[in-house]
């Protein structure tokens, strides 16, 4: 699998949109772990609602928040108030039963707010304006590159 | 009208290779898993592997991991399974089973293949 | 591997009876469980998917409850074209199924 980066900006949002086959993935619930180094586990963050009809539900755990529109295709996951220690590799999971599928990679690069260094004044951004999609928002990265690290679950 | 259909009864030696066969029509095959079950002589159902056509993705039962191969070719909406050397074991028939899908999420065998018997003996 | 267990083996009913079949999960499937019931010579039929909904054509005296790893398909009265074998299976982890309830005329 390829890997996607995702670069975002401390202190404000990311936003990760995983697409998967819908018709191919029914019933599943989906997951957004961390990979522990190149060949350790993926240690799960959060998963999707236990009832596969209210997968369209947000669920968080701390800053974390994920839902899935299940006809759609697309878990969707929120990294809230970016910080420093977040940055890693992530992956997106179908799930069944022990089984864990991975749909996609990421890897979250976190840029340091260059306001920080300086008087900012009174210049501030609303949180709905702040955060992340992607590629989709202009002050996000996104770029594929190849890894060697093996699909674990 | 959907449906599976499965290919003829064989009868082999053991030691050889056969591939059975089992062709969807009537509904989009590649959007659906299609799985194998086995059921030996006067016993019941064994589930050995399934396949998604989309993207010919294939998960086995441990107990026949590495024992068959699950193939899929979608352009003419068939799956196969395949020995590469028979036992007199692999005696029994052979059903492939369509994974349907409800709205509640829920999924369950809902459309079968007639069989295939297979016969092994030298 | 998920260990699907069924009881009775053997099930002797008088038609118009009540048949209650029972379907235990060696851990929980959830509500990830069907039956179906096979008549000799014919391929497997299913009967109820997600613990208790009935198929489409299934008549309304079949009916399935439980969750979890305790499961039990009732025949609420016997007709004589449901002396069959019947399957539970589970599909939360792999495709797991029972060994199967034969159930004979009594």
């Known amino acids: 699998l390829n890997t996607t980066v995702l670069q975002g900006m401390a202190g404000q949002s990311l936003r990760v949109s995983c697409t998967y086959d819908a018709l191919k993935h029914w019933g599943r619930r989906k997951a957004w772990c961390r990979q522990l180094g190149e060949e350790g586990p993926c240690q799960r963050v959060v998963s999707t609602h236990g009832v596969w009809l209210l997968a369209f539900l947000k669920k968080r755990n701390g800053s974390t928040v994920i839902a899935d529109d299940t006809l759609a295709g697309t878990v969707t996951i929120t990294l809230k108030n970016l910080q420093a220690g977040d940055a890693g590799l992530y992956q997106c999971q179908s799930l069944r039963g022990r089984e864990a599928e991975v749909l996609q990679k990421v890897l979250v690069e976190v840029l340091e707010d260059p306001l920080d260094d300086q008087d900012a004044g009174d210049l501030w951004v609303p949180e709905e304006s702040s955060s992340f999609e992607g590629a989709q928002v202009e002050h996000s990265t996104s770029r594929n590159q190849e890894t060697s690290f093996p699909p674990t679950s | 009208e959907v449906q599976l259909v499965q290919s003829g009864a064989e009868v082999k030696k053991p030691g050889e290779s056969l591939k059975i066969s089992c062709k969807g029509s009537g509904y989009s095959f590649t959007s659906y898993w299609i799985g194998w079950v086995r059921q030996m002589p006067g016993k019941g159902l064994e589930w050995m592997g399934i396949i998604y056509p989309g993207d010919s993705d294939t998960r086995y039962s441990p107990s026949f991991q590495g024992q068959v191969t699950i193939s899929a070719d979608k352009s003419i909406s068939t799956a196969y399974l395949q020995w590469s050397s028979l036992k007199a074991s692999d005696t029994a028939m052979y059903y492939c089973?369509?994974?349907?899908?409800?709205?509640?999420?829920?999924?369950?065998?809902?459309?079968w293949g007639q069989g295939t018997m297979v016969t092994v003996s030298s | 591997e998920i260990v699907m267990t069924q009881s009775p083996a053997t099930l002797s009913v008088s038609p118009g009876e009540r048949a209650t079949l029972s379907c235990r999960a060696s851990q929980s499937v959830s509500s990830n469980l069907a039956w179906y019931q096979q008549k000799p010579g014919q391929a497997p039929r299913l009967l109820i998917y997600g613990a208790s909904t009935r198929a489409t054509g299934i008549p309304a005296r079949f009916s399935g409850s439980g969750s979890g790893t305790e499961f039990t398909l009732t025949i609420s009265s016997l007709q004589s074209e449901d002396f069959a074998v019947y399957y539970c299976?589970?599909?939360?982890?792999?495709?797991?199924f029972g060994g199967g309830t034969k159930v004979e005329i009594k």
């Open positions: 299976q589970q599909d939360d982890d792999g495709y797991t």
């Open positions: 089973a369509r994974l349907g899908r409800w709205s509640s999420g829920s999924t369950a065998f809902d459309i």
